[in-house]
């Protein structure tokens, strides 16, 4: 006999990185017939939704009208069908950005390199932070962490054409409060013809959620996006 229901998916629209004072919607998708959804933040109950009619709804939304550091952190959701509860969703890390200052991103030996060359990014921010984050544009929003008093190094090692793309960095005041993004740095990796033709910018995640983040920073608009649990492995 089943003791729990499958875990729901949780994600943020338009993006899990939210500029301060902008809006974001936390979505939780469970099953049709779920009579109650609960959103939890850092382990505490935050909000409850009882969709009507439950048999026609499998996704609920919780809305944050103006993002701030108190709303940034780890969210999860659960749902109930009858008396049976689901497993909790993966954790959604909701990050507030545009806090305080703007770091500077540079790349060594330069933005145009040959396949096989060793490349290092440097993110510098003079205010009180010791953690830095490097992100490559693309749907995966893969985050690398680096540490240093005012600057962090991000060695990419010998690069391939798969490393091509646009990078930005953030200073982090804590895990969920980040600085303004740096200006972008576009890394161009040239290689032999075979490699170049076979290496799209981000083969795993073609859709651009970074563009969505930028749209949020510039206009604060909401945009409908495909389901994406950024914490899913």
């Amino acid at each position: 006999q089943q003791q729990t229901l499958p875990k729901p998916f949780i994600w943020a629209e338009p993006h899990f990185m939210v500029p301060k004072e902008k809006q974001v919607t936390i979505c939780c998708q469970g099953n049709y017939g779920a009579v109650e959804y609960q959103l939890h933040f850092e382990g505490s109950l935050f909000a409850v939704d009882r969709p009507k009619p439950p048999e026609r709804i499998n996704k609920v939304q919780f809305y944050i009208p103006d993002m701030n550091s108190r709303m940034a952190g780890q969210y999860s959701c659960i749902y109930r069908v009858g008396e049976l509860w689901s497993e909790p969703s993966n954790l959604l890390d909701l990050v507030v950005t545009e806090m305080y200052d703007t770091p500077t991103l540079s790349v060594h030996p330069g933005p145009e390199v040959i396949s096989g060359e060793k490349v290092t990014f440097y993110c510098r921010l003079d205010t009180a932070t010791s953690m830095f984050l490097l992100l490559k544009e693309g749907r995966s929003s893969h985050v690398q962490r680096g540490y240093g008093k005012v600057q962090a190094e991000f060695p990419l090692g010998p690069v391939t054409t798969a490393h091509r793309g646009t990078y930005r960095c953030f200073g982090s005041y804590n895990n969920h409060a980040w600085s303004f993004p740096s200006e972008p740095v576009k890394l161009l990796v040239t290689g032999d013809i075979e490699n170049t033709s076979l290496a799209p910018e981000d083969p795993t995640f073609p859709a651009d959620t970074w563009g969505t983040y930028l749209l949020t920073t510039e206009t604060g608009l909401q945009k409908d996006h495909a389901l994406w649990d950024h914490t899913a492995q």
């Epitope: 505490s44 109950l45 935050f46 909000a47 409850v48 939704d49 009882r50 609920v60 939304q61 709303m71």
Partner: nanobody
Framework: QVQLVESGGGLVQAGGSLRLSCAAS????????MGWFRQAPGKEREFVAG????????YYADSVKGRFTISRDNAKNTVGLQMNSLKPEDTAVYYC????????????????????WGQGTQVTVSS
Amino acid sequence: QVQLVESGGGLVQAGGSLRLSCAASGRTFSSYAMGWFRQAPGKEREFVAGISWSGDSTYYADSVKGRFTISRDNAKNTVGLQMNSLKPEDTAVYYCAAASGQVQTVVVVTDRWYHYWGQGTQVTVSS
């Protein structure tokens, strides 16, 4: 902007009843999720009961479940809290709060998501 004014507090004996009312100004009242919180001396503010903007969904703290009932009248811009079988531990200042932007069936439990607050009304339950 919504302004909230609570009324109905007072002194009551244990086992008695009180009805709190919260009057809201603002034409968009019907689009706000509403809640009642309380704060006893020397304690943190705690959630008591919440209601979605449609009035279809309610949620209660375990400590008041079965004794308190939250309701709303969107035509009159009011939210009520009927409190029965009162206990001395219910003694506190009771606050009404409004949260904007949620869909019609969402009940907000955390005080972080409530944007507007009343000044509070004192409820004292004597033994």
